[in-house]
Interface confidence: medium
Amino acid sequence: TPLGPKWPEPVFGRLASPGFPGEYANDQERRWTLTAPPGYRLRLYFTHFDLELSHLCEYDFVKLSSGAKVLATLCGQESTDTERAPGKDTFYSLGSSLDITFRSDYSNEKPFTGFEAFYAAEDIDECQVAPGEAPTCDHHCHNHLGGFYCSCRAGYVLHRNKRTCSALCSGQVFTQRSGELSSPEYPRPYPKLSSCTYSISLEEGFSVILDFVESFDVETHPETLCPYDFLKIQTDREEHGPFCGKTLPHRIETKSNTVTITFVTDESGDHTGWKIHYTSTAQPCPYPMAPPNGHVSPVQAKYILKDSFSIFCETGYELLQGHLPLKSFTAVCQKDGSWDRPMPACSIVDCGPPDDLPSGRVEYITGPGVTTYKAVIQYSCEETFYTMKVNDGKYVCEADGFWTSSKGEKSLPVCEPVCGLSARTTGGRIYGGQKAKPGDFPWQVLILGGTTAAGALLYDNWVLTAAHAVYEQKHDASALDIRMGTLKRLSPHYTQAWSEAVFIHEGYTHDAGFDNDIALIKLNNKVVINSNITPICLPRKEAESFMRTDDIGTASGWGLTQRGFLARNLMYVDIPIVDHQKCTAAYEKPPYPRGSVTANMLCAGLESGGKDSCRGDSGGALVFLDSETERWFVGGIVSWGSMNCGEAGQYGVYTKVINYIPWIENIISDF
């Protein structure tokens, strides 16, 4: 008869032999069935026990059973070799039910008082198992009142049997050319009740090779082929396996770019599994041979699908595909064993024919017409009238395809006209205007454009003149008629030049004195330099040492002569420099405004008069001989003077050119 309250009320109580604490009667049989809720067990212990002792408890006994299993058969008061009394032992049901049977036989030799026992239901800790028994759960076991549940580590899922953890081992796709894969947990035992699928998927053209490495241990059977756990390898062509046992399978050359590996395990066994190292191969491409003067990178034993190489040319050689230059070259091996691009050539860099040098020439040094890498050419300027500017003229064809000077310049050298050459041998005479002879003043420029003026040639495309002489034409430079290379003002034989632009000094104010009376005319073409057309030199820093008081300068021009007419033939006069204070004082008195002579001016002439420049000479150069370089340079520009040219006590006033060197250089370099 069931005892104890209905669930969920607590299950506990007391049992005792009939008549306890008095003696029990003969021929008694009593049975108690105790039932606990599922997930609980029953605990029973005795507080009193006194039964007749008999061999193997055959006469009187208390039997404890749980299900089909007898937990104990008890009799006597104390345990002997063959009989057991409960003593202080506690007894536990195996499940949630416990049967207690009390029996006494037909006689007792003396009175026995029987037994008293107490019971209670208690939670079973299913997570605790005896040593050597299988664990309740594969991974994690969680006990709770009335039961337990299992859970799994990351990467596993609980099987529908609620105890086994199946590996989440499907869907892995390997796309690298080589790699490793193994059974879950390898080299520890693989999980039970799992179905793993691994895919190797390479680009078409590759062939996967599988090597089983280290160890192989998959549950097997002596008679049946892999009935429990097995490994299968599937390609689009064939299936390999199933594999099991302890022997490493042989290498598998799949001849396929896609492989599916299936691993299935059952609910039992303890095996370490497998490990596969996979590689791939493909049809190699023809071995690349570097073109002459080039090299292949990287160098490999062979080149298969997707492998590539680049070609790099030696210095001085360039990549060419046919006739087309390439910045770089890389070829890729294709699945059919061919390269995607034909091999280029490394062709020697050719700088091409060197550019012609204005007023100069070029000579092939390496060999006639040789213009390839490391070839040398020599530029030189036309002798006498031109000189090479800051360059030795030697150019080498460099790897970048440019002719390059020893200083690394890629631009042409410049043939600058030689300045300050004159056929005149200076004399000491300082009186009387003289007729110029051919080559005496080859820098002399005649400027026609409303009035007659003069200028001096600088380099081969600039004219230095006075601002007041070209002021009216500053916005119409093309109106200036510029002539050179002639002595006769009216001669039809001259070299014509035209103006591209007129630059008047920003400090010059027209009709308000002659300070900063300086201008530059840029010619629209370079003039050819010869003995009759040669530029004047600009003064060196040291030039003032040749322009002290009483030093002789020479003015030239077609200006008014003593007869009051413009000169037909170019005239010149040698005149001394006048002390600046003396000159300033000469122009301090009326009709000249105070401050007419500035520090930007120099004066030249005779105190007694008679030697001077005059109207029509404006803009012309007052030149001096640099005795160190033996070249003539421009010290002054004919600017202004007394109303009456050559007047005693008055002097010709010239723009002091040395003060304007930075201005001149800036304009010429900017334009």
Epitope: C285, P286, P288, M289, P291, D336, G337, S338, P342, P344
Partner: antibody, heavy 125, light 107 residues
């Protein structure tokens, strides 16, 4: 005069092995890539394998990869073809051939300029 | 792999006639096509290399042309000894392949 003489052919069971040899004379052997080309009875020509002049690289047709090995001994002017795991479809006359060392468009690629008389390999049970 | 297709499979002509044999590649092979002649019981013999380059010792009546995918072997005037099987071969890919052959027979 260029001469290539093959030997080592014969009857072999499926799965069996055979080693073919080719003795070369009359040219500078170590200047040439060498190849084996086969011809099944009544069928066309089929390239089998190539080895570069210095032995540094080998090339095989897919169906023989892993089963056949081409090698050479430049000191002995000899070319070899080791054939394992033979199949019925490997039955053919095997020709030893020089593969020209010329390279076109910058890659080693060859034509077969000199040929031996061939040796017959029969794979049958 | 690169597939070479030769046409016609058989060509019947008489001595003195002009023979034109065709070889078509499944993809461009530049000029990396070579032609061979094979007579019964003999090894093949190289006739033309790299589509059109002649081989010393080969009669001038043999010539080749083409590039890319279409190639032709021409025998200008057939001699009795020219009746044989002719093969083309590509070396553009390292996986060398031959055509299936054209049999040139006496008409």
């Amino acid at each position: 005069e260029v001469q290539l003489v093959e030997s080592g052919g014969g009857l072999v069971q499926p799965g069996g092995s055979l080693r073919l040899s080719c003795a070369a004379s009359g040219f500078t052997f170590n200047d040439y890539n060498m190849a084996w080309v086969r011809q099944a009875p009544g069928k066309g020509l089929e390239w089998v394998a190539t080895i570069l002049f210095d032995g540094s690289r080998t090339y095989y047709r897919d169906s023989v990869k892993g089963r056949f090995t081409i090698s050479r001994d430049n000191a002995k002017n000899s070319l070899y073809l080791q054939m394992n795991s033979l199949r019925a479809e490997d039955t053919a006359v095997y020709y030893c051939s020089t593969e020209s060392p010329y390279y076109s468009e910058g890659y080693y690629q060859g034509y077969f300029d000199y040929w031996g008389q061939g040796t017959l390999v029969t794979v049958s049970s | 792999e690169i597939v070479l297709t030769q046409s016609p499979a058989t060509l019947s002509l008489s001595p003195g006639e002009r023979a034109t044999l065709s070889c078509r590649a499944s993809q461009s092979v530049s000029t990396s096509i070579h032609w061979y002649q094979q007579k019964p019981g003999q090894a093949p013999r190289l006739l033309i290399k790299y589509a059109s380059r002649s081989i010393s010792g080969i009669p001038a009546r043999f010539s080749g042309s083409g590039s890319g995918t279409d190639f032709t072997l021409t025998i200008s005037s057939l001699e009795p000894e020219d009746f044989a099987v002719y093969y083309c071969q590509q070396s553009y890919s390292s996986l060398y392949t031959f055509g299936q052959g054209t049999k040139l027979e006496i008409k």
